[in-house]
């Protein structure tokens, strides 16, 4: 067998097919990996060969065609099943070829099961809906090409396991679902199956996603630094440790890039010469909305560091805003003495070391101090 | 936790209708399913239906379809379950049942049983 | 709708030893099963779901495996508390059927 280029097993392509439902599987080539369709590659005397290897097995197999009722078929750059078996797990491979030319690409293909209320290993596409944004529609997804437009299918929506009829807010229109008004309880799985006839045969279609209620556009707002601010001075001496939080809150907006990062003296931590480290952690809320916190680290610091400028900078498709924290060396408590003078000024300055002192016993995260006047 | 207490025991006479209650504590009432099970005595579970509140949805088995009505009062986390034209093979212990999620297919909850006794 | 056929209908067991009860599907109901316990005056309690995962709080001496149209219930080494009637349920197919269950007590 002469040389063919193999690009080897498609993974990124892993097809998975429910038991019994038909499935017409493009072969990949055409899609993803050579630059001419199959039209062009058919009118130039190349040949598409389908083969596949049981799940489990080594041994590479010519397709049945001639299974009853034509189970599987191939239909230009299409193989067919109608419908599938369990058994029909495995890799497939399509092979274009002739004399001269030889090109080929394996992929995955599960045939999964599913119980009443559609749980399957299935991996589900996720459909954002806003809240409370008035009418949104999730539409019944990959059933182009399996009926003439001619045929007009009977379908069915379901929540979870649940029959959509008569939901006073979510309401089914043929290939489309419509939500009156998505809250956060419509946050779950959707499931349309699609019934159509073919050649006096019934057969169905099950497409499942997950719905996801996220923020409203209308009430997404530029990002919201809630840490450094005015209330709070980090004030340290000279070979203790620093900390700062930047804390970041962004709307959630429909594929916005959340960016935060520090500055010091308006440059990038790695652009300055002290030893720096940043963690970042993220958290969502239940509509996708992101609270991020950078945590600027010093781990000795000096004299020279604290009277550095330390900008939070935050950035989303909303804006750009930047917040600077208010870092100080700490000036010694002056002792508190009878000669004082100063009536109750010593003590002042003793409740207010106090307090300070209290502040760092009291488990504050980062070490911060509020700052007394 | 989550809890459903139903109402207690009943006696009906055939041709007439029964009532149960069940209500609900722990989790959002208006967005779990509530169903329906009965048992007749020494025998085995059966579904009868179930209703998802805050959707204003019902579900019933074809063969109580007519004549099982099920409701649910949100302000009071409250499930009920009608049953009319009573006959003696409805002498039965009713169950309310909630699954975990709308996608689960079993009960993880059930309420305490009301036993209704259908008698000339 | 599918039938759930539980055998045997009475289980005679004694105390420490293993108890093992089966439930056929009239169809195949894939992984699709539950499986409960109820004892007299009492609701049913959840023990098994997805025919093999135990639900929360089940000791480990219930296990439960099949799949398709034959299934098992397995308590390992029977305690006091375990004589009760048990009850498996298929949710693979409206509407979900129970069987007729398998009351074990003791010998």
């Known amino acids: 067998s002469e040389r063919c280029d193999d690009w080897g097993l498609d993974t990124m392509r892993q097809i998975q097919v429910f038991e019994d439902e038909p499935a017409r599987i493009k072969c990949p080539l055409f899609e993803h990996f050579l630059k001419f369709n199959y039209s062009t590659a058919h009118s130039a005397g190349l040949t598409l060969i389908w083969y596949w290897t049981r799940q489990d097995r080594d041994l590479e197999e010519p397709i049945n065609f001639r299974l009853p009722e034509n189970r599987i078929s191939k239909e230009k750059d299409v193989l067919w099943f109608r419908p599938t078996l369990l058994n029909d797990t495995g890799n497939y491979t399509c092979m274009l070829r002739n004399t001269t030319y030889c090109s080929k690409v394996a992929f995955p293909l599960e045939v999964v099961q599913k119980d009443s209320c559609f749980n399957s290993p299935m991996k589900l596409p996720v459909h954002k809906l806003y809240i409370e944004y008035g009418i949104q529609r999730i539409t019944c997804p990959n059933v182009d090409g399996y009926f003439p437009s001619s045929v007009k299918p009977t379908i069915t929506w379901y929540m979870g396991c649940y029959k959509i009829q008569n939901f006073n807010n979510v309401i089914p229109e043929g290939m489309n679902l419509s939500f009156l008004i998505a809250f956060i309880s419509n946050n779950g799985n959707y499931t349309c199956v699609v019934t159509y006839p073919e050649n006096g045969r019934t057969f169905h279609l099950t497409r499942t996603l997950t719905v996801k209620v996220v923020g409203s556009p209308k009430n997404a707002v530029p990002p919201v630094i809630h840490s450094p601010n005015d209330h709070v001075v980090y004030e340290k001496e000279p070979g203790e440790e620093l900390l700062i939080p930047c804390t970041v809150y962004f709307s959630f907006l429909m594929d916005s890039r959340n960016e935060v990062w520090w500055t010091i003296d308006g440059k990038k931590p790695d652009d300055i010469p002290i030893d720096v480290t940043i963690n970042e952690s993220i958290s969502h809320s239940r509509t996708e909305d992101e609270t991020r916190t950078q945590i600027l680290s010093i781990k000795k610091v000096t004299s020279e560091d604290l009277k550095r400028s330390y900008v939070c900078h935050a950035r989303s498709a909303k804006g750009e805003v930047a917040k600077a924290a208010t870092v100080k060396q700490k000036v010694p408590a002056p002792r508190y003495t009878v000669e004082g003078g100063g009536g109750t000024g010593g003590l002042n300055d003793i409740f207010e070391a106090q307090k300070i002192e209290w502040h760092e016993g009291g488990g504050h995260h980062h070490h911060h101090h509020h700052h007394h006047h | 936790q989550v809890q459903l207490v139903q109402s207690g025991a009943e006696v009906k006479k055939p041709g007439s209708s029964v009532k149960v209650s069940c209500k609900a504590s722990?989790?959002?009432?208006?967005?779990?399913?509530f169903h329906w099970v009965r048992q007749a005595p020494g025998q085995g579970l059966e579904w009868m239906g179930g209703?998802?509140?805050?959707?204003?949805?019902?579900f019933y088995a074809q063969k109580f379809q007519g004549r099982v009505t099920i409701t649910a009062d949100e302000s009071t986390s409250t499930a009920y379950m009608e049953l009319s034209s009573l006959r003696s093979e409805d002498t039965a212990v009713y169950y309310c049942?909630?699954?975990?999620?709308?996608?689960?297919?079993?009960?993880?909850?059930w309420g305490q049983g009301t036993l209704v006794t259908v008698s000339s | 709708e599918i039938v759930m056929t539980q055998s045997p209908a009475t289980l005679s067991v004694s105390p420490g030893e293993r108890a093992t009860l089966s439930c056929r599907a009239s169809q195949s109901v894939s992984s699709n099963l539950a499986w409960y316990q109820q004892k007299p005056g009492q609701a049913p309690r959840l023990l098994i779901y997805g025919a093999s995962t135990r639900a929360t709080g089940i000791p480990a001496r219930f296990s439960g495996s099949g799949s398709g149209t034959e299934f098992t219930l397995t308590i390992s080494s029977l305690q006091s508390e375990d004589f009760a009637v048990y009850y498996c349920q298929q949710y693979n197919n409206w509407p979900w059927t129970f069987g007729q269950g398998t009351k074990v007590e003791i010998k």
């Open positions: 209703i998802i509140p805050g959707y204003g949805a019902t």
């Open positions: 722990g989790g959002v009432f208006s967005y779990y399913a």
């Open positions: 049942a909630r699954p975990v999620s709308y996608s689960s297919g079993w009960y993880d909850y």
